[in-house]
Structures are given as structure tokens and as C-alpha cells.
Interface confidence: low
């Protein structure tokens, strides 16, 4: 069954997906699609990478991590209720039926009416450590749950602008990645 991720209307949603390239710059094509992963490819593609670059994306869908190091986590900007649903991250490993497919369920909740001094995410995991991430906008305090033995799609929700930070390395070091080669 799909792992569930939550965001509020107006926030950025983050759907994690990682792999480890076999060698620096030796990238594997990845596609993100709206809807569960079909047998081949992605349905309703919202973003696609090739062996070198992000070669297709649609408005509001971004890779804010370093995809050249295998961080292909999807950020959806300014979500609405219509963004709810299943998303497919497909790591297109060469060879017959070698693809790694991950279905992630995004649940969008109406925005909270009570104003808070700091914008907060809805985290489903405990958050033993706090950190500040660097993003395009003002710094925000974010939280990260402890990382037990988990598979690729069970990573706790991270900051909406993960990028190339210590946190990204923590995640990769946790083993929550697919290794290619």
C-alpha cells in the first residue's frame, strides 16, 4: 500500500524519492506521474529526467534536491485540494522489468484557520532533531523524524527546499536509497 504524505492547502508538498547513481554523473532516467505506477513509464507525467538533465516538467512541479546525486524528490508548490492522490516515482533502471516503482499518496488538508507565528508542516513521525534549512525564501525551522529501517518511500517528510544540505547526506547515509549498479 502507498505511504501517505500530508500537506495543507497553500503549502508546498514534498514527496521523497532517492536512488544512488552507479557512478558520478551516470544518471538513470526518472519520471514522476499523477496516478499509480502503470506497467511501463508514468501516467500523466508531471516531471521527467534523462541521463543528464531534467528534460520535462510542468508548472508547480520541481526537483529541489540535487538530482544528479540521486535526490529526485518531488516538490509541488502551493498545493490545492485537487493535488490529492497517488503519485508515481519511477526510477527507470536499464534492462527488462528493472524499474523501481514507488507509489506515494498525497493527502491535502484544508488550511488551518488559526494563525501561528511560524509556518509548520504536519509531521506524522516524532521529531527528535530540529534544523534550519536554506531555501529560496526565508529560513524555516523544519523537523525530521528518526530514520529506522525503512524503505525508500517511508522517509519522513522533509523541508520543502531540501537541496544540497547536510540533511540530504543524512538521508542518503541512512540507507533509504535505491543503489544502482
Amino acid at each position: 500500500s502507498e505511504v501517505e504524505y500530508r500537506a495543507e492547502v497553500g503549502q508546498n508538498a514534498y514527496l521523497p524519492c532517492f536512488y544512488t547513481p552507479a557512478a558520478p554523473g551516470n544518471l538513470v532516467p526518472v519520471c514522476w506521474g499523477k496516478g499509480a505506477c502503470p506497467v511501463f513509464e508514468c501516467g500523466n507525467v508531471v516531471l521527467r529526467t534523462d541521463e543528464r538533465d531534467v528534460n520535462y516538467w510542468t508548472s508547480r512541479y520541481w526537483l529541489n534536491g540535487d538530482f544528479r546525486k540521486g535526490d529526485v524528490s518531488l516538490t509541488i508548490e502551493n498545493v490545492t485540494l485537487a493535488d490529492s492522490g497517488i503519485y508515481c516515482c519511477r526510477i527507470q533502471i536499464p534492462g527488462i522489468m528493472n524499474d523501481e516503482k514507488f507509489n506515494l499518496k498525497l493527502v491535502i488538508k484544508p488550511a488551518k484557520v488559526t494563525p501561528a507565528p511560524t509556518r509548520q508542516r504536519d509531521f506524522t513521525a516524532a521529531f527528535p532533531r530540529m534544523l534550519t534549512t536554506r531555501g529560496h525564501g526565508p529560513a524555516e525551522t523544519q523537523t525530521l523524524g528518526s530514520l529506522p529501517d525503512i524503505n525508500l518511500t517511508q522517509i519522513s517528510t522533509l523541508a520543502n527546499e531540501l537541496r544540497d544540505s547536510r540533511l540530504a547526506n543524512d538521508l542518503r547515509d541512512s540507507g533509504a536509497t535505491i543503489r544502482i549498479g
Partner: antibody, heavy 121, light 107 residues
């Protein structure tokens, strides 16, 4: 072939204005980040400003904030740097450059040939 | 702002020499460092990104490494076309900042 071509440089008096253009070909600027980086004569490189054209997000170096404005016209595949209240210390070759890894802060894989801005009375 | 202190500011070397240029960041920048080569009158060219990734088309004699906040560009065997000025750049946070440059001259 990816190309960036700057234009609009020249001699201007202190306090004057110039508008630099960066015409891109071989790629769509709305899929990348565009930056302006300058180099004073005989000096090193200094980042000036950056824009994400599709989102209109902009950032500026403190030294040019409130004087320079970066913008982009995706229909013309061109980025611009409007420079107002120019000072002698703004004299430099201005390069536009493309952000490499698909986000604002990263290395620059393609650069234009540069356009010289001279601020002098 | 993060300062990138590059050394040496210039060096003389011969063809075939191994050349090392270092850059020290004033605070943690993770692996977010790039290296560029610039020749007189020309725009910089990207050599290395994310500290150690060789940019497409760059000869393999160029390599980059990181140790904490120290970053190194190595040219394993200097070629005639490598005589130029080299710059490091941190792209970890705003504003991105460059080192002051290292001029590699013919001995």
C-alpha cells in the same frame, strides 16, 4: 547549441542607467536559472543577481540591491538587467550565465561572452 | 556572506606538472563548490561542480575533492592549454561567492 549573448553595455555617467540583455538560444530560459556575474577590470568574479524566469523569483547581491533589477521575458527567451544609479565601482564586464543544476544556487554551465559597462564622467 | 579563500593567488608550473589549488570556505558549504577556468578576454568555463563532479567534456586530468571546508582542484598533468586563471565558487547559500582566483603561469 546552447548560447547566451549579452548586449547593452557601454559608457555611462555616474548616476546614469543602462539595460543589459541576455538572449538565450538552444534552450528555454523558463527551464533554468539565469544569473548575472560581473568582473571588474583585472579583478575576480562577483555574482550580481539571479532569476528563476518561470516563477519570477529574484535575488540580488547587497552591493546592487535597490539599484539593479533582473527580469526575464520567456516569450523572447531573454533575461535583462536594468541598472540604475550607476557608480564608478559598477564598471565591469557583465556576464549572464545559466544555472546548472536546476535550482537557484548552483554552478553555471554556460556563460555569455560578456558586455563591458564603463561608468565614468 | 561566506568567504572563499583561495590559494595560492598565482603559481608557476611546467607542462606535465601536477598542480593543486585550494579553497577554504569560511563556514560549512557541504559539497556545494564549483571550479571554473578563465582565459584572458574570455568567459569562465565550468570544470567541476558539487566539489568533485567533472563537468561534461572536461578532461579527466582535472579533479576536485573536499575535506571539511577545504576544497581542492587538482590538475594531474598540466597541459599547455591549462595555463589560465582558476576560480572556486560556493553555491550553498545566497549570495554565491567566488574565490579571488589563482593564476597558473608557465615556468
Amino acid at each position: 547549441e546552447v548560447q547566451l549573448v549579452e548586449s547593452g553595455g557601454g559608457l555611462v555617467q555616474p548616476g546614469g542607467s543602462l539595460r543589459l540583455s541576455c538572449a538565450a538560444s538552444g534552450f528555454n530560459i523558463d527551464r533554468y536559472y539565469i544569473h548575472w556575474v560581473r568582473q571588474a577590470p583585472g579583478k575576480g568574479l562577483e555574482w550580481v543577481a539571479g532569476i528563476t524566469p518561470v516563477r519570477g523569483y529574484t535575488e540580488y547581491a547587497d552591493s546592487v540591491k535597490d539599484r539593479f533589477t533582473i527580469s526575464a521575458d520567456t516569450s523572447k527567451n531573454t533575461a535583462y538587467l536594468q541598472m540604475n544609479s550607476l557608480r564608478a565601482e559598477d564598471t565591469a564586464v557583465y556576464y549572464c550565465a545559466r544555472g546548472y543544476v536546476y535550482r537557484m544556487w548552483d554552478s553555471y554551465d554556460y556563460w555569455g561572452q560578456g558586455t563591458l559597462v564603463t561608468v565614468s564622467s | 556572506d561566506i568567504q572563499m579563500t583561495q590559494s595560492p593567488s598565482s603559481l608557476s608550473a611546467s607542462v606535465g606538472d601536477r598542480v593543486t589549488i585550494t579553497c577554504r570556505a569560511s563556514q560549512d558549504v557541504n559539497t556545494a563548490v564549483a571550479w571554473y577556468q578563465q582565459k584572458p578576454g574570455k568567459a569562465p568555463k565550468l570544470l567541476i561542480y558539487s566539489a568533485s563532479f567533472l563537468y561534461s567534456g572536461v578532461p579527466s586530468r582535472f579533479s576536485g575533492s573536499r575535506s571539511g571546508t577545504d576544497f581542492t582542484l587538482t590538475i594531474s598533468s598540466l597541459q599547455p592549454e591549462d595555463f589560465a586563471t582558476y576560480y572556486c565558487q560556493q553555491h550553498y547559500t545566497t549570495p554565491p561567492t567566488f574565490g579571488q582566483g589563482t593564476k597558473v603561469e608557465i615556468k
